[in-house]
Amino acid sequence: EPTMYGEILSPNYPQAYPSEVEKSWDIEVPEGYGIHLYFTHLDIELSENCAYDSVQIISGDTEEGRLCGQRSSNNPHSPIVEEFQVPYNKLQVIFKSDFSNEERFTGFAAYYVATDINECTDFVDVPCSHFCNNFIGGYFCSCPPEYFLHDDMKNCGVNCSGDVFTALIGEIASPNYPKPYPENSRCEYQIRLEKGFQVVVTLRREDFDVEAADSAGNCLDSLVFVAGDRQFGPYCGHGFPGPLNIETKSNALDIIFQTDLTGQKKGWKLRYHGDPMPCPKEDTPNSVWEPAKAKYVFRDVVQITCLDGFEVVEGRVGATSFYSTCQSNGKWSNSKLKCQPVDCGIPESIENGKVEDPESTLFGSVIRYTCEEPYYYMENGGGGEYHCAGNGSWVNEVLGPELPKCVPVCGVPREPFEEKQRIIGGSDADIKNFPWQVFFDNPWAGGALINEYWVLTAAHVVEGNREPTMYVGSTSVQTSRLAKSKMLTPEHVFIHPGWKLLEVPEGRTNFDNDIALVRLKDPVKMGPTVSPICLPGTSSDYNLMDGDLGLISGWGRTEKRDRAVRLKAARLPVAPLRKCKEVKVEKPTADAEAYVFTPNMICAGGEKGMDSCKGDSGGAFAVQDPNDKTKFYAAGLVSWGPQCGTYGLYTRVKNYVDWIMKTMQENSTPRED
């Protein structure tokens, strides 16, 4: 507890002090006082630098004195032999004796009293920035007019802080400008603009005069601008040393003007204004900005449109453009969005064709569709080459996004028919010679495949069985072989409307319009043993002349057997209709005159006994295409005949092409269209 006075005596005083002793006293007087310590008696063994025995006086870390020997007062009116005056309120006294004393020493007697100190004059560092006022036990600071005492109660400054500027334009100057600014002041000014505007400060060099920097380059008085985490300055000197236009990139700016006690100059004056926050003109590849400007600022909106072949993908959805807004923080919205090359994705598969994997599926990539040759060809042209277009579709120059259509090649047998050894009016044949040949098992008959979904046959073949079982692709129609061949399932039978349906078909004498179409449930896959025959064209090139040769094939009656197991074929010439009329009907069911002959019939045969017969009905009479010798077309269908091995009558297919096309068109699926 601090005291105002006290007494300190060496051990055993006034008797001799003992050897080997160390004792200390901590003196403390109240705050605001100094200590006056004085000795009235001093009798301590004398040694050089008081090395043996001593009394030591310490103030903080400083040794104020070290005493030994004998002292007497110089003043007859005062008992004081030694004294110390310290301007601090704490003091330590330490007494030490060594192991031996040659004489008897009585030690010391000392007293301390608290004394007033003049804080205003007693210290090197002046405690007050302006006026210092001493009183007993303390002091106080005071300020000149228009200054105020800071919270530290020592420093005076002018009241220049706390101003907040919110207007978009303004002027700020140091206190008293252009008169000298106050010393020892810290002036803080705040500029706070609405978000989206940056503070731009402009100064003129001549409007700035602040005490210059010291020799180390440190500003004694300084002006500093702080915008968020960016600092401009400190600035000082005669004439503004910084940029005359400071773009802070922030809507908040703190201006701090700090002055010391000396060297007042006229100060500074600045102007500020709020600029809409600029957003950088970013380099966004593969795109254009609309509107195009040299500078974009807060609230500006641009439409960024991707160049052709590029798109912006957001949430797995592609778009060709997006909007971006210059935000209050100087950054663009949607800045993560980028124009990237359009991806057309995996190309679609096509029936009876293929597409090679492209190196890439991105914009500009090229793919090529091909058909399964030689059985299919590309019907709708375009060459099969597609490129990845800007809209994300695979596009062909001719067809656009429409895919190529692979349709069966017609009328081309894999192996041409060659008449080998004669077998009673015909030759053995292979299905590869007549890949269009269809076998009907009930009734035993034939038909001709004309495309993936349609079989052409004679009306009399299907009039009694509207759900015929058909087979393709096999030379032999042995049951074991048929099991391995392709069975065709009918969906619907279309008999020509001109075909007269009879109660008793066996007595038929009128075979006019003996033609029918069978629509298949599933498409037929073409190959070396299954391939359609062409239909005749409608031009006069397809009008048959007498003597024109055609091929017939089937598993019908031969001279030896009622039914053939292996496919037979023959080449026969077209004959005048009268030749057929002249042949006597074998086993007639009516008068010879009752048999009807019409222009819808072709007469053929009569050579070397080659003819079609029972069981061949519905098969094609195949003639070489006059415009393409590599192809055969179905000129006729085996219909009827007066007598096997003579002349036969064939339905003239050319007369029914319109009906065939119309029927197929009206009963197709979207896949065929």
Partner: antibody, heavy 118, light 109 residues
Framework: EVMLVESGGGLVKPGGSLRLSCAAS????????MSWVRQAPGKGLEWVAT????????YELDSVDGRFTISRDNSKDTLYLQMNSLRAEDTALYYC???????????WGQGTLVTVSS | QIVLTQSPATLSLSPGERATLSCTAS???????LHWYQQKPGKAPKLWIY???NLASGVPSRFSGSGSGTDYTLTISSLQPEDFATYYC??????????FGQGTKLEIK
């Protein structure tokens, strides 16, 4: 006749791996893009992955990307799905399907069941 | 991704009645790339209608499909016993993922 037959499913612990196969027949396998689609018990269909006809381009569902890999061997007419780091939520019947016009899935296998459980 | 929402989740009708199944997309879908599948319990799905309105092979003509943009419909003019199944709509979009609706279960009332 087009046929797709999946195999390789079974019971596996979380974190484990499986390789599903899909054997194709009745069509020219190398001409068609193929997909895997799964169906969790009592739930709807979820597309998993697609591969182009030649096998150079693949797309996978985000939640399986990096864990599942679709591939094919056209010489063997077989489609594969390599499934690593399996999770309980991958439990499902996995179907392979052929992609036809406009990426419709015109033929599907009968499915193979994958159960992920500890 | 494009989300397909089918409604209703379950549709209870009697044979002979007309059924209308709806599929709504979260964003526009090309008509060419919207397909429908039929699935019966324990069986694999079957392509039923492709490109919005084209019937797959073997699908009876009582089925029809229509729609454009975000709204698509599968209609059965007169329900037959074999039509009771779950129907899924499905869309393809080049940026993926391919998505399916959650399904509509068509059950006998």
């Amino acid at each position: 006749e087009v046929m797709l037959v999946e195999s390789g499913g079974g019971l596996v612990k979380p974190g484990g791996s499986l390789r599903l196969s899909c054997a194709a027949s009745g069509f020219t396998f190398s001409n068609y893009a193929m997909s895997w689609v799964r169906q969790a018990p009592g739930k709807g269909l979820e597309w998993v992955a697609t591969i182009s006809s030649g096998g150079s381009h693949t797309y996978e569902l985000d939640s399986v990307d990096g864990r599942f890999t679709i591939s094919r061997d056209n010489s063997k007419d077989t489609l594969y799905l390599q499934m690593n780091s399996l999770r309980a939520e991958d439990t499902a019947l996995y179907y392979c399907a052929r992609l036809f016009t406009k990426h419709a899935m015109d033929y599907w296998g009968q499915g193979t069941l994958v159960t992920v459980s500890s | 991704q494009i989300v397909l929402t089918q409604s209703p989740a379950t549709l209870s009708l009697s044979p002979g009645e007309r059924a209308t199944l709806s599929c709504t997309a979260s964003s526009e879908v090309s008509e060419s790339y919207l397909h429908w599948y039929q699935q019966k319990p324990g069986k694999a799905p079957k392509l039923w209608i492709y490109s919005t309105s084209n019937l797959a092979s073997g699908v009876p003509s009582r089925f029809s499909g229509s729609g454009s943009g975000t709204d698509y419909t599968l209609t059965i003019s007169s329900l037959q016993p074999e039509d009771f199944a779950t129907y899924y709509c499905h869309q393809y979009y080049r940026l993926h993922p391919i998505t399916f609706g959650q399904g509509t279960k068509l059950e006998i009332k």
